[in-house]
Interface confidence: low
């Protein structure tokens, strides 16, 4: 199974200190992964290569994303990407990419969270994306 | 074979201008790779996808890591990641990720070196990690 | 098929506002991919993991690379990496890595473009590279 996702939108719920991205498939092979709004549901357990990139346009001193999974009654951070941002708006433009290999369980929900309220993201599909490859 | 490693600690030997990371397995499939303190020994020769991320909080003007292999009587840099760091401690916060595909030989020792004495690293397992996927 | 490429040189054509990298193979397995000067030709259609890193030494406010494919009469950006750069030359030293999974067609030409005239790149093979893995 392979899944490459691109953004639909990004939102912060009222009074939330995080920004979440809603995803749609750009490339899909196999049925082991299913995009579900702000998350991706794992249908087939196994070892996956996960990758995530977010393109930030924000002068907040550090920006980044956290890729986590929720399942079996607990939440676990898998990996995160962190980028210090310039304070000048014209320079505050950075992509943040990270990836890793993890064992995912059937029913896990994978999500990308930016731990900032109303983070300023560039949602172009070649700047912000999320992907899975079953190994 | 698949191996995803996370840090145990990072040390600079006396009078050394480098910082090395000691690794422990977080995910292991197959017997082709073996964590050995500051290095990873290749048991099965072949083509591997290697990835490395280090999370820096250091005001040294540039930080980064070098992934190299030692074997057959020589040392070779495979890839490196470099990140310019802000001079203000509150902003000096960057992950540096890189990866590539390489042919590794049986007996090779792979290591991650930060070419700075006493580099200030974040050793959280979702910020600093190292991985191998045999292709 | 697997292909890991390193730079030969990088040039800006007269009056061009982009810098292109010319590539040579460092590791090759299979015949599905062929380096052709500034591009890589896809011989075998399929789903590929692509990765790209460029090492910048440039004080231009933001630097980065665009990985795109040209084929079937159109050009498409697959992904890009963007890095804000410090204004001080001694600090302006950043690698920019990104990757993703894409369906490539037979005859597609893949290229890495830096959308800056005469971009200052470090063409060491462990700092700037390009790779493909057929999944």
């Amino acid at each position: 199974s392979v899944l490459h996702l691109v953004p639909i939108n990004a939102t912060s719920k009222d009074d939330s200190d995080v920004t979440e991205v809603m995803w749609q498939p750009a490339l899909r092979r196999g049925r082991g992964l299913q995009a579900q709004g702000y998350g991706v549901r794992i249908q087939d357990a196994g070892v996956y290569l996960l990758y995530s990139q977010v393109l930030f346009q924000d002068v907040t001193f550090t920006m980044g994303q956290v890729v986590s999974r929720e399942g079996q009654g607990r939440q676990e951070t898998l990996f995160r990407c962190i980028r210090s941002m310039p304070s000048h708006p014209d320079r505050a433009y950075n992509s943040c990419y990270s990836a890793g290999v993890f064992h995912l369980h059937q029913g896990d929900i994978l999500s990308v969270i930016i731990p900032r309220a109303r983070a300023k993201l560039n949602l172009s599909p070649h700047g912000t994306f999320l992907g899975f490859v079953k190994l | 074979s698949v191996l995803h490693l996370v840090p145990i600690n990072a040390t600079s030997k006396d009078d050394s201008d480098v910082t090395e990371v000691m690794w422990q397995p977080a995910l292991r499939r197959g017997r082709g790779l073996q964590a050995q303190g500051y290095g990873v020994r290749i048991q099965d020769a072949g083509v591997y996808l290697l990835y490395s991320q280090v999370l820096f909080q250091d005001v040294t003007f540039t930080m980064g890591q070098v992934v190299s292999r030692e074997g057959q009587g020589r040392q070779e840099t495979l890839f490196r990641c470099i990140r310019s760091m802000p001079s203000h401690p509150d902003r000096a916060y960057n992950s540096c990720y890189s990866a590539g595909v390489f042919h590794l030989h049986q007996g090779d020792i792979l290591s991650v070196i930060i070419p700075r004495a006493r580099a200030k690293l974040n050793l959280s397992p979702h910020g600093t990690f190292l991985g191998f996927v045999k292709l | 098929s697997v292909l890991h490429l390193v730079p030969i040189n990088a040039t800006s054509k007269d009056d061009s506002d982009v810098t292109e990298v010319m590539w040579q193979p460092a590791l090759r397995r299979g015949r599905g991919l062929q380096a052709q000067g500034y591009g890589v030709r896809i011989q075998d259609a399929g789903v590929y993991l692509l990765y790209s890193q460029v090492l910048f030494q440039d004080v231009t406010f933001t630097m980065g690379q665009v990985v795109s494919r040209e084929g079937q009469g159109r050009q498409e950006t697959l992904f890009r990496c963007i890095r804000s750069m410090p204004s001080h030359p001694d600090r302006a030293y950043n690698s920019c890595y990104s990757a993703g999974v894409f369906h490539l067609h037979q005859g597609d030409i893949l290229s890495v473009i830096i959308p800056r005239a005469r971009a200052k790149l470090n063409l060491s093979p462990h700092g700037t590279f390009l790779g493909f893995v057929k999944l």
């Epitope: 200190d17 550090t62 956290v66 986590s68 939440q75 676990e76 951070t77 731990p115 | 145990i8 600690n9 040390t11 600079s12 000691m22 999370l55 909080q57 250091d58 401690p89 916060y93 006493r118 200030k120 690293l121 974040n122 050793l123 959280s124 910020g127 | -």
Partner: antibody, heavy 120, light 107 residues
Framework: EIQLQQSGPELVKPGASVKVSCKAS????????MYWVKQSHGKSLEWIGY????????GYNQKFKGKATLTVDKSSSTAFLHLNSLTSEDSAVYYC?????????????WGQGTSVTVSS | DIVMTQSQKFMSTSVGDRVSITCKAS??????VSWYQQKPGKSPKPLIY???NRFTGVPDRFTGSGSGTDFTLTINNVQSEDLADYFC?????????FGAGTKLELK
């Protein structure tokens, strides 16, 4: 300025429970783990455990498993230490401390401490 | 668990002296050791991390050294405000453990 402000002293009866709070300010609460440390009167320091405010993940010193429970409220940037089935052995000062995951790997800012006295 | 042994419970000194407080780990902890100063009724104040790095604002008369199993906190030119309890801590592996402390007092 980074600060950890702990709740006031507690006088509780044996068998009861107590909840100590630690409000963080001056930094991004979810960026660093929060540690809890016990100091009995005139004695050394004992590490109780940690909580990762980002995802609620915890790790405990085996000695305090079943005795201590760590939680956070991200909305108020507050960490909590809940101690149950209290005995005189639990009388101590309890500190919260931020673990700087990034620069130093150790506890760089400490709360002022909360005194818990267990007495009938 | 790793045991951190501070063999001197008390050390007597005079203002202007040089004093060395030692700490021994039961296992190799690399340089994952910090030192804290604590005054009565106050929380511990971090002095040294990674065995030899001073925290911001810590006077340079405080010096940490050592690696592996043997660590030393040295105070040069002792000042009256340095009279306090000193604890070492290892953060190489869980559970984190502290030494029993060394009380620095005036002769």
């Amino acid at each position: 300025e980074i600060q950890l402000q702990q709740s006031g002293p507690e006088l509780v009866k044996p068998g009861a429970s107590v909840k100590v709070s630690c409000k963080a300010s001056g930094y991004s609460f979810t960026d660093d783990n929060m540690y809890w440390v016990k100091q009995s009167h005139g004695k050394s320091l004992e590490w109780i455990g940690y909580i990762d405010p980002l995802n609620g993940g915890t790790g405990y010193n085996q000695k305090f498993k079943g005795k201590a429970t760590l939680t956070v409220d991200k909305s108020s940037s507050t960490a909590f230490l809940h101690l149950n089935s209290l005995t005189s052995e639990d009388s101590a000062v309890y500190y919260c401390a931020r673990r700087d995951n990034y620069a130093t790997g150790t506890m760089d800012y400490w709360g002022q401490g909360t005194s818990v006295t267990v007495s009938s | 668990d790793i045991v951190m042994t501070q063999s001197q419970k008390f050390m007597s000194t005079s203002v202007g002296d040089r004093v060395s407080i030692t700490c021994k780990a039961s296992k190799n902890v690399g340089t994952d050791v910090s030192w804290y100063q604590q005054k009565p009724g106050k929380s511990p104040k971090p002095l040294i991390y990674w065995a030899s790095n001073r925290f911001t604002g810590v006077p340079d008369r405080f010096t940490g050294s050592g690696s592996g199993t043997d660590f030393t906190l040295t105070i040069n030119n002792v000042q009256s405000e340095d009279l306090a309890d000193y604890f070492c801590e290892q953060y190489s592996s869980y559970p984190l453990t502290f030494g029993a402390g060394t009380k620095l007092e005036l002769k």
